[in-house]
Structures are given as structure tokens and as C-alpha cells.
């Protein structure tokens, strides 16, 4: 399930000077470099989590500059220009703004943490080159985290870090079709730590999802649900404090 390819490889098709995988050119922006907060809209929505917002302000130690995490985020509707100077995105693959579905307070209200479980709508489905970014902090004594890319009642991609499965830490990936779970794919590399901030990035590729955590490539998961346009929601749950969830096209 893991591989040695990176986002850079995926986009350029060439060798990658950063063997760790997902390059720092877009990964670890300095806080002063600017960023792309997702657009937001005010008001609470029936059936959605209570007021929260993203782009949220990144918690201490998180990854400023990643999509959706913008230290000192401006009021909703205020949109800074593209980053420049150190950490700016390369022009060849500059990410766009992040798609956003917060339920914020009044205009200008400070962003707060998102309520978990949280649903990020993907109303147009997913498409190759879509990058989904989740920022948060693992709770102390955490047991599990789960990302569920949902297609109606099915789960196209279930990403499930387990902190204590028979005294082992393991990441389980699977697909649920017609209420039946398929064959599990297990990954023993486990980059999450209780009490620590994290950044999960999921890049949609034509035939697989590619997952990086804290800017290091972790795994890929071949598409079992082929109709990507029907994957209409990302459910985020588990023992985390969630700061932001957003997407961008790269």
C-alpha cells in the first residue's frame, strides 16, 4: 500500500529531489509567507455541526500556510493575494484557494475549532489533482481517527489510524459497498502521536488516493469505487481536535 512516490512525482512525472515524498515547496510554508484561506460563509445550517469555521487558526505547532490554515485569518470574505517570498508556491503547480464549508458565526467572527464528527461536502465529487487537507491535533490517549470518503451510503475510502489494536498502532484502509466491508489494507508506519498536531493531505490521482501526513508520504490506496464524481462528502471523526478541512485543485 505504501510507495516511494511523492506529490512532486505525481505531478511532474520526474525524479524527486526530496525522497521523503511530498515536497516542501508547498508543504511547510513559513508563517510569514502568506496563504490561501478558504472562502467561508456565515450562519448555521440544519443538519450541520454547530458553529465553527475554517479556515481556522492553526494550533501551536501546526502547519501555517497549508490550505485552510492561515495564522491570523482575515474575516470571511477578505482574501489575501498569492504568497510571495520564502515558501511561495512554485508557479508551475500553484495551488488555488481552498473550498470551504464552515458554519461560522457572524461576519468577522474569529474562527473556532470544528465540531467532530465533521462533514466536508464535496458536491462536485472528487477529481484527479484535488488535494484535501485536514489540520488538527490528536487528543491525549487517543484511540482512533477516521476519514471516510462517502459515496451515498457507501464508503469509497476509509482511512483509519488505530492507536491500540492489540497493543499495536496500525492504519487500516478499506471500502464499504452495500454495507459490506472489503479486504483491509494495513500500514504499520504510524506518523500520529497522541497530543500532537497533524496535517493529513489526500491527493486524488486517476487510479488511487495518495496520503501524506506531516508532509511525508504515507500510503496510496487504489480506487475501488470508480465513479469519483459520486464521492460527495468527507466524514472526519475520532479522537481529534479539528482545526480545518478544505480542498484545492493543484
Amino acid at each position: 500500500m505504501a510507495d516511494n512516490f511523492s506529490l512532486h512525482d505525481a505531478l511532474s512525472g520526474s525524479g524527486n529531489p526530496n525522497p521523503q515524498g511530498w515536497p516542501g515547496a508547498w508543504g511547510n510554508q513559513p508563517a510569514g509567507a502568506g496563504g490561501y484561506p478558504g472562502a467561508s460563509y456565515p450562519g448555521a445550517y440544519p443538519g450541520q455541526a454547530p458553529p465553527g469555521a475554517y479556515p481556522g487558526q492553526a494550533p501551536p505547532g501546526a502547519y501555517p500556510g497549508a490550505p485552510g490554515a492561515y495564522p491570523g485569518a482575515p474575516a470571511p470574505g477578505v482574501y489575501p493575494g498569492p504568497p510571495s517570498g520564502p515558501g511561495a508556491y512554485p508557479s508551475s503547480g500553484q495551488p488555488s484557494a481552498t473550498g470551504a464549508y464552515p458554519a461560522t458565526g457572524p461576519y468577522g467572527a474569529p474562527a473556532g475549532p470544528l465540531i467532530v464528527p465533521y462533514n466536508l461536502p464535496l458536491p462536485g465529487g472528487v477529481v484527479p489533482r484535488m488535494l484535501i487537507t485536514i489540520l488538527g491535533t490528536v487528543k491525549p490517549n487517543a484511540n482512533r481517527i477516521a476519514l471516510d470518503f462517502q459515496r451515498g451510503n457507501d464508503v469509497a475510502f476509509h482511512f483509519n489510524p488505530r492507536f491500540n489494536e492489540n497493543n499495536r498502532r496500525v492504519i487500516v484502509c478499506n471500502t464499504k459497498l452495500d454495507n459490506n466491508w472489503g479486504r483491509e489494507e494495513r500500514q504499520s508506519v504510524f506518523p500520529f502521536e497522541s497530543g500532537k498536531p497533524f496535517k493529513i493531505q489526500v491527493l486524488v490521482e486517476p487510479d488511487h488516493f495518495k496520503v501524506a501526513v506531516n508532509d511525508a508520504h504515507l500510503l496510496q490506496y487504489n480506487h475501488r469505487v470508480k465513479k469519483l464524481n459520486e464521492i460527495s462528502k468527507l466524514g472526519i471523526s475520532g479522537d481529534i481536535d479539528l482545526t480545518s478541512a478544505s480542498y484545492t485543485m493543484i
Epitope: Y41, P46, S96, P123, G124, G152, S232, M249
Partner: antibody, heavy 115, light 107 residues
């Protein structure tokens, strides 16, 4: 083939409510968000809101949050939009449309508010 | 809210001409742009989505391009049946918004 069949035209009194329906066929109803769009005579298109038929999660345009209520009946693959406290400003054609990019549209339901 | 601006309300053209209709978003909408055609008394019809992907059954004379805030619908050789209203739309961030429309008419 994908079809969205909307209910017939409505003539209603000011202050009343109306319930519009959109019956989906030709695809898996729960796999796509359903949008509702308003178009006043001679005017452009306004997004009212959307609902996920798999779990009834809704998102509304703030302009319509006290006007429209979106619901679904999963068993019959029907999406509904209730419009309340109607005024002449609500006279319009209302469309249902599937998916974020709205790839298939209903034929529209004309709502006329008149005393 | 994201504002989608179609600066040309009316565009005059002739059959066989190439015409480009533009749409500018008030912020980056990351190619989540669709284009619709609407004729009088009819529902809108999707032409293109993800800025450049042609919807099923749409003739290949319709093409789309753009990224960031600027998007274009091009009809390579206008046919009589293309005379209609054209709307752009973003489904990037709610409320989803439409441009005000561009009417394509014969000179």
C-alpha cells in the same frame, strides 16, 4: 437516463406556504447532492440550497434560510422544497438540479404569489 | 459570497464566427466552474464543468478554459441553435453563485 420530474405550477396566496417536489430517476438518488435554484421572470439564476439525500444534510443560501426548507424521501427518490410566508418576491420558476455542477435539471415549477 | 461577473450582457455574432464569453470570479474558485446554456422557456443545460470538461452530448465546438479567477467559454463556430443565454457558475464555496448571464445574438 437521468431524469428529474418536478411538480406542476402553483398559484398561491401571500402568506401561504407551498411544497415543491422533484422526483429523481435513472441514477442512484443517494449518491448526488440535490440543488434548488430560483429564477424570477427575465432574471438570472439564484442558488437556494442543497441537500444530500443519503443523510439529509443541508446547506442553504443565507438569503433563503428562513424561506426554504429542503427535505427528501429516500424511499421514493423525491426531493422537496417547502417555501413559507410567500410574497410577490417569491414568484419565480424553481428548478431542482443534481450534483455540484448541476448536470441534470428538472423542467422547473412556476410559483405565482397573488391575492 | 463569491461574485461571478460576466462583463458582456449581450454579444453579437454571426453564424460561423468564433466567440468567447468570459467570467471573472471575485476570488480563486479553483476550476470549480460550470457553464450553462438557457433558451427561452427552457431549463438551463450544462455545457462544461470543472472549467473545461464537456458534458455528455455537448458538441465539441464548445470548449472551456481558465483557472484561478478567470474563465472562458468559447464556441469555435457559432451555429444558429447556439443563440441563447449563457451563465457561468461556481460550486466552490456556498452559496454557489451564477454570473448574470451573457446573451448571444445575431448581428
Amino acid at each position: 437516463q437521468v431524469q428529474l420530474q418536478q411538480s406542476g405550477a402553483e398559484l398561491v396566496r401571500p402568506g401561504a406556504s407551498v411544497n415543491l417536489s422533484c422526483k429523481a430517476s435513472g441514477y442512484t438518488f443517494t449518491n448526488y447532492w440535490m440543488n434548488w435554484v430560483k429564477q424570477r421572470p427575465g432574471q438570472g439564476l439564484e442558488w437556494v440550497g442543497m441537500i444530500d439525500p443519503s443523510d439529509s444534510e443541508t446547506h442553504y443560501n443565507q438569503m433563503f434560510k428562513d424561506k426554504a426548507t429542503l427535505t427528501i424521501d429516500k424511499s421514493s427518490s423525491i426531493a422537496y422544497m417547502q417555501l413559507s410566508s410567500l410574497t410577490s418576491e417569491d414568484s419565480a420558476v424553481y428548478y431542482c438540479a443534481r450534483w455540484g455542477a448541476m448536470d441534470y435539471w428538472g423542467q422547473g415549477t412556476s410559483v405565482t404569489v397573488s391575492s | 459570497d463569491i461574485v461571478m461577473t460576466q462583463s458582456h450582457k449581450i454579444m453579437s455574432t454571426s453564424v460561423g464566427d468564433r466567440v468567447s464569453i468570459t467570467c471573472k470570479a471575485s476570488q480563486d474558485v479553483s476550476t470549480t466552474v460550470a457553464w450553462f446554456q438557457q433558451k427561452p422557456g427552457q431549463s438551463p443545460k450544462l455545457l462544461l464543468y470543472w472549467a473545461s470538461t464537456r458534458h455528455t452530448g455537448v458538441p465539441d465546438r464548445f470548449t472551456g478554459s481558465g483557472s484561478g479567477t478567470d474563465y472562458t467559454l468559447t464556441i469555435s463556430s457559432v451555429q444558429a441553435e447556439d443563440l441563447a443565454l449563457y451563465y457561468c457558475q461556481q460550486h466552490y464555496s456556498p452559496p454557489f453563485t451564477f454570473g448574470s448571464g451573457t446573451k448571444l445574438e445575431i448581428k
